[in-house]
């Protein structure tokens, strides 16, 4: 698995470099996760034909993956820093159960899947420090998450492959939209 941001050899070799600001750290963290997702997508697409499948809609109906919409305040029209930040954190917390599902779904990229999961937890902590209105952030119910995880794991092989593909694609899109908005803050 790749080394987490701030721990690569370049950082060690340059001790006099300015420490990263909180925004730079978040930016770097998201790009690190996006790199991890790319690696996982590569394995998924090589292993099955899910990436070209037109049957995505069938599986997508069973998943309630977080999505960015205009009302969330993260787009330029109606941009609202606090509303958007709450949406990003809430969305990431909702993705955690799906990232847990991904854990055992990869053969050659098992470490990478773990790195994406752990890096997302760190990202949530970074963002929570940035948010002023933590009360507005709703944490998913653990019991609901547990039964969702059981349901996802009980699917047939084709649906499990499709679910993996959809989770990775949706998580990537969510992170891209999140970082677009964060770069305006």
């Amino acid at each position: 698995a790749p080394v987490p941001p701030g721990e690569d050899s370049k950082d060690v070799a340059a001790p006099h470099r300015q420490p990263l600001t909180s925004s730079e750290r978040i930016d770097k963290q998201i790009r690190y996760i996006l790199d991890g997702i790319s690696a996982l997508r590569k394995e998924t697409c090589n292993k099955s034909n899910m990436c070209e499948s037109s049957k995505e809609a069938l599986a997508e109906n069973n998943l309630n993956l977080p999505k960015m919409a205009e009302k969330d305040g993260c787009f330029q029209s109606g941009f609202n820093e606090e509303t958007c930040l709450v949406k990003i954190i809430t969305g990431l917390l909702e993705f955690e159960v799906y990232l847990e599902y991904l854990q055992n779904r990869f053969e050659s990229s098992e470490e990478q899947a773990r790195a994406v999961q752990m890096s997302t937890k760190v990202l949530i902590q970074f963002l929570q420090k940035k948010a002023k209105n933590l009360d507005a952030i709703t944490t998913p119910d653990p019991t609901t998450n547990a039964s969702l995880l059981t349901k996802l794991q009980a699917q047939n092989q084709w649906l499990q492959d499709m679910t993996t593909h959809l989770i990775l694609r949706s998580f990537k899109e969510f992170l891209q939209s999140s970082l677009r908005a964060l770069r305006q803050m």
Partner: nanobody
Framework: EVQLVESGGGLVQAGGSLRLSCTAS????????MGWFRQAPGKEREFVAD????????WYADSAKGRFTISRDNAKNTMYLQMNSLKPEDTAVYYC?????????????????WGQGTQVTVSS
């Protein structure tokens, strides 16, 4: 890395319109966030507009809001900038840029591929 070529620049009178195109060669154009920047003589390059992987997610500089429209056609590997109500102060070389992370943003450092630019001159 993607190769970018701009076209559509030219000389136009104030109040007129132009449509710039940026065509990308290379695979997976749809996974790139794309942006337009411009550089007027003697000035620094500045952000104009950008469009995310989700084509509804666009951002504009204040100077471009209401007059310029950014769009993309993934089937044609092309991004556009429709510029209306042009002013002499819009005179600049317009550059198109791509971000392989699919994020984009209002700063040059967010982009890893750049075109050579196309000249836009607005006469009064």
């Amino acid at each position: 890395e993607v190769q970018l070529v701009e076209s559509g620049g030219g000389l136009v009178q104030a109040g007129g319109s132009l449509r710039l195109s940026c065509t990308a060669s290379g695979r997976s154009f749809s996974s790139y966030a794309m942006g337009w920047f411009r550089q007027a003589p003697g000035k620094e390059r500045e952000f104009v507009a950008d469009i995310g992987v989700n084509p509804d997610n666009t951002w504009y500089a204040d100077s471009a809001k209401g007059r310029f429209t950014i769009s993309r056609d993934n089937a044609k590997n092309t991004m556009y900038l429709q510029m209306n109500s042009l002013k002499p102060e819009d005179t600049a070389v317009y550059y198109c840029a791509a971000d392989s992370y699919g994020v984009g943003g209002g700063a040059e450092r967010y982009y890893d591929s750049w075109g050579q630019g196309t000249q836009v001159t607005v006469s009064s």
